[in-house]
Interface confidence: low
Amino acid sequence: MMTGTIETTGNISAEKGGSIILQCHLSSTTAQVTQVNWEQQDQLLAICNADLGWHISPSFKDRVAPGPGLGLTLQSLTVNDTGEYFCIYHTYPDGTYTGRIFLEVLESSVAEHGARFQIP
């Protein structure tokens, strides 16, 4: 039975040219996290494997930085980065948990950031 829940940064906004941290946190389960995939719509951005570390998709390598933790930092944001992002936690023995984040990249210099989720 899957008892875990994923907390995410939710809906967030950022300024064009800036950077943003995408973060998810898996709680309420003792399952072992074996791998976390970060995806934008159907496109793989990055993989963090518990044993092998990070693999950044080549087309995002210069704008995506691993971390903090299992999160992902997007840099040099463009309006085209607006959209849904998914953190997919592969766990044993529970299986797969998915979290959703919606990022809006604004042209305006008055981008209002929603409440930021911080992992202590």
Epitope: K61, P66, G67
Partner: antibody, heavy 115, light 107 residues
Framework: EVKLVESGGGLVQPGGSLRLSCATS????????MSWVRQPPGKALEWLAL??????????EYSVSVKGRFTISRDNSQSILYLQMNTLRAEDSATYYC??????WGQGTLVTVSA | DIQMTQSSSYLSVSLGGRVTITCKAS??????LAWYQQKPGNAPRLLIS???SLETGIPSRFSGSGSGKDYTLSITSLQTEDVATYYC?????????FGSGTKLEIK
């Protein structure tokens, strides 16, 4: 721009020691796995050692050929990677490269082990 | 340890031709395979990661394919600047072993 610059190579006698350094810039050092790879003259690449990132506790892995003789370490405050090489043998003669996750490599430093 | 076997040490190809370099792993590596190009006196240059993903700035005449244990690097319309030694590397399981290299020459 990501930069990796190795130093510390040179001529050393068999049984001797050497410490290689890899100065890095252009990225957040603590977020990346770092490795050492070597290449004897005219031969193939050989993966030597890995040190993981902060998120993975800076744990290390070694190839059988250097385990117990070489030690990989990192100075996260200065963004420098090290390879401490002890009990060197003639077959350790090679160009030593440091590499960052994502395909970035330095230009290498030459180590020659000879009497 | 996973052994990586590049069956051809040398390949001779005509300019403008097509070449396929093969790499076989001793165990499944789940597409965690990289291809590097190395020219004399230079550090290796990453061409492909994840078995098929072309690195930024690498010409589209390079492509990677394969799965499980068997992988290939293909170069179409061979150019003089493609003369180099090509290495595969698995990064599924430490130690992250390399193949022995395939040296490409112009016929």
């Amino acid at each position: 721009e990501v930069k990796l610059v190795e130093s510390g190579g040179g001529l050393v006698q068999p049984g001797g020691s050497l410490r290689l350094s890899c100065a890095t810039s252009g990225f957040t050092f603590i977020d990346y796995y770092m490795s050492w790879v070597r290449q004897p003259p005219g031969k193939a690449l050989e993966w030597l050692a890995l040190i993981r990132n902060k998120a993975n506790g800076y744990t290390t892995e070694y190839s059988v050929s250097v385990k117990g003789r070489f030690t990989i370490s990192r100075d996260n405050s200065q963004s420098i990677l090290y390879l401490q090489m002890n009990t060197l043998r003639a077959e350790d003669s090679a160009t030593y490269y440091c590499a960052r996750d994502g395909g970035y490599w330095g230009q290498g430093t030459l180590v020659t082990v000879s009497a | 340890d996973i052994q990586m076997t590049q069956s051809s040490s040398y390949l001779s190809v005509s300019l403008g031709g097509r070449v396929t370099i093969t790499c076989k792993a001793s165990d499944h590596i789940n597409n965690w395979l990289a291809w590097y190009q190395q020219k004399p006196g230079n550090a290796p240059r990453l061409l492909i990661s994840g078995a098929t993903s072309l690195e930024t700035g690498i010409p589209s005449r390079f492509s990677g394919s394969g799965s499980g244990k068997d992988y290939t690097l293909s170069i179409t319309s061979l150019q003089t600047e493609d003369v180099a030694t090509y290495y595969c590397q698995q990064y599924w399981s430490t130690p992250f072993t390399f193949g022995s290299g395939t040296k490409l020459e112009i016929k």
